[in-house]
């Protein structure tokens, strides 16, 4: 769950998630509403959708702990464990690399962004 995600994001981006991403914009961190503010925020919105999909399948997304390896800058999700664990790892891997791809457009002003300012249509999954 959340411990896996925090560790993976730190390994891939080099940033401490609790200081840089949770929360950020309108979708990074718990919950999410409105139009994403930038590419980094879109990463989190897509990740929310990934989790939502697993929840509809019956996965316990916050409880499941998965195994993975981080080597030479890449994440290798374990082929063992449950289907939910494998898919959860895939969701987290995707958001970690998405955040890394968009480090150059990271905006400090969106850190602790005031959620009531998150307006517009929330993108569908």
């Amino acid at each position: 769950g959340i411990l896996n995600l925090n560790k993976m994001v730190k390994q891939v981006t080099g940033k401490m998630p609790i200081l840089s991403y949770w929360p950020y914009g309108c979708h990074c961190g718990l919950g999410g509403r409105g139009q994403p503010k930038d590419a980094t925020d879109w990463c989190c919105q897509t990740h929310d959708c990934c989790y939502d999909h697993l929840k509809t399948q019956g996965c316990s997304i916050y409880k499941d702990y998965y195994r993975y390896n981080f080597s030479q800058g890449n994440i290798h999700c374990s082929d063992k464990g449950s289907w939910c664990e494998q898919q959860l790892c895939a969701c987290d891997k995707e958001v970690a690399f998405c955040l890394k791809r968009n480090l150059d457009t990271y905006q400090k002003r969106l850190r602790f962004y005031w959620r009531p300012h998150c307006r517009g249509q929330t993108p569908g999954c």
Epitope: G58, S60, K63, S82, W83, C84
Partner: antibody, heavy 113, light 107 residues
Framework: QVQLKESGPGLVQPSQTLSLTCTVS????????MHWVRQPPGEGLEWMGV???????HYNSTLKSRLSISRDTSKSQVFLEMNSLQTEDTAIYFC???????WGQGTLVTVSS | DIQMTQSPSSLPASLGDRVTITCRAS??????LRWFQQKPGKSPRLMIF???NLANGVPSRFSGSRSGSDYSLTINSLESEDLAIYYC?????????FGGGTKLELK
């Protein structure tokens, strides 16, 4: 080491209910998904359903209306129940631990009067 | 549902031949593909996992590859013990699907 073994009746009457048990050892059912797969004589493999490590179940849409999978984690057993059996349900029934690295030896079920 | 189209259904070959079996996925399954070998009266045996990784105890003459939505199992130099039926399996979705099988037999 990891072991899986299916057990149940070899012969079932048409329209009756099939009950199979998969007894496992070497691991805990609360940590792994368990699948049922069947194979009619001379044919290919057909996925039937799964009971996840968290207890949730999913079934093949073609069998959903008559299939039920459950488990007893304390006894390390997974159960398959399928009703309204017909001759085309004659097959070898396998249980397998996800991600399909371990399989039982299979049990032949013949549906005949 | 994701369909796995396996070909050929039958493959006559000679000992020492290099043989290739293919599965095509109807949707993106990434590397969530496994190959199994099954001999008469036996359970399926895992040969390849993650599309390209050799399972424990599998001879190095076996290999797996991927090109887009096409997945292949290759046996470099066929031996008599390799004669069997081979199945692919996708497990990207929670409801996995098998290919129809390929019967590898002597010419």
């Amino acid at each position: 080491q990891v072991q899986l073994k299916e057990s149940g009746p070899g012969l079932v009457q048409p329209s009756q209910t099939l009950s199979l048990t998969c007894t496992v050892s070497g691991f805990s059912l609360i940590s792994y998904d368990m699948h049922w797969v069947r194979q009619p004589p001379g044919e290919g493999l057909e996925w039937m359903g799964v009971i996840w490590s968290n207890g949730n179940t999913h079934y093949n849409s073609t069998l959903k209306s008559r299939l039920s999978i459950s488990r007893d984690t304390s006894k390390s057993q997974v159960f398959l129940e399928m009703n309204s059996l017909q001759t085309e349900d004659t097959a070898i029934y396998f249980c397998s631990r996800y991600p399909f690295a371990y399989w039982g030896q299979g049990t032949l079920v013949t549906v005949s009067s | 549902d994701i369909q796995m189209t396996q070909s050929p259904s039958s493959l006559p070959a000679s000992l020492g031949d290099r043989v290739t079996i293919t599965c095509r996925a109807s949707q993106d399954i990434g590397d969530y593909l496994r190959w199994f070998q099954q001999k008469p009266g036996k359970s399926p045996r895992l040969m390849i996992f993650g599309a390209t990784n050799l399972a424990n105890g599998v001879p190095s003459r076996f290999s797996g590859s991927r090109s887009g939505s096409d997945y292949s199992l290759t046996i470099n130099s066929l031996e008599s013990e390799d004669l069997a039926i081979y199945y692919c399996l996708q497990h990207k979705e929670y409801f996995p699907t098998f290919g129809g099988g390929t019967k590898l037999e002597l010419k």
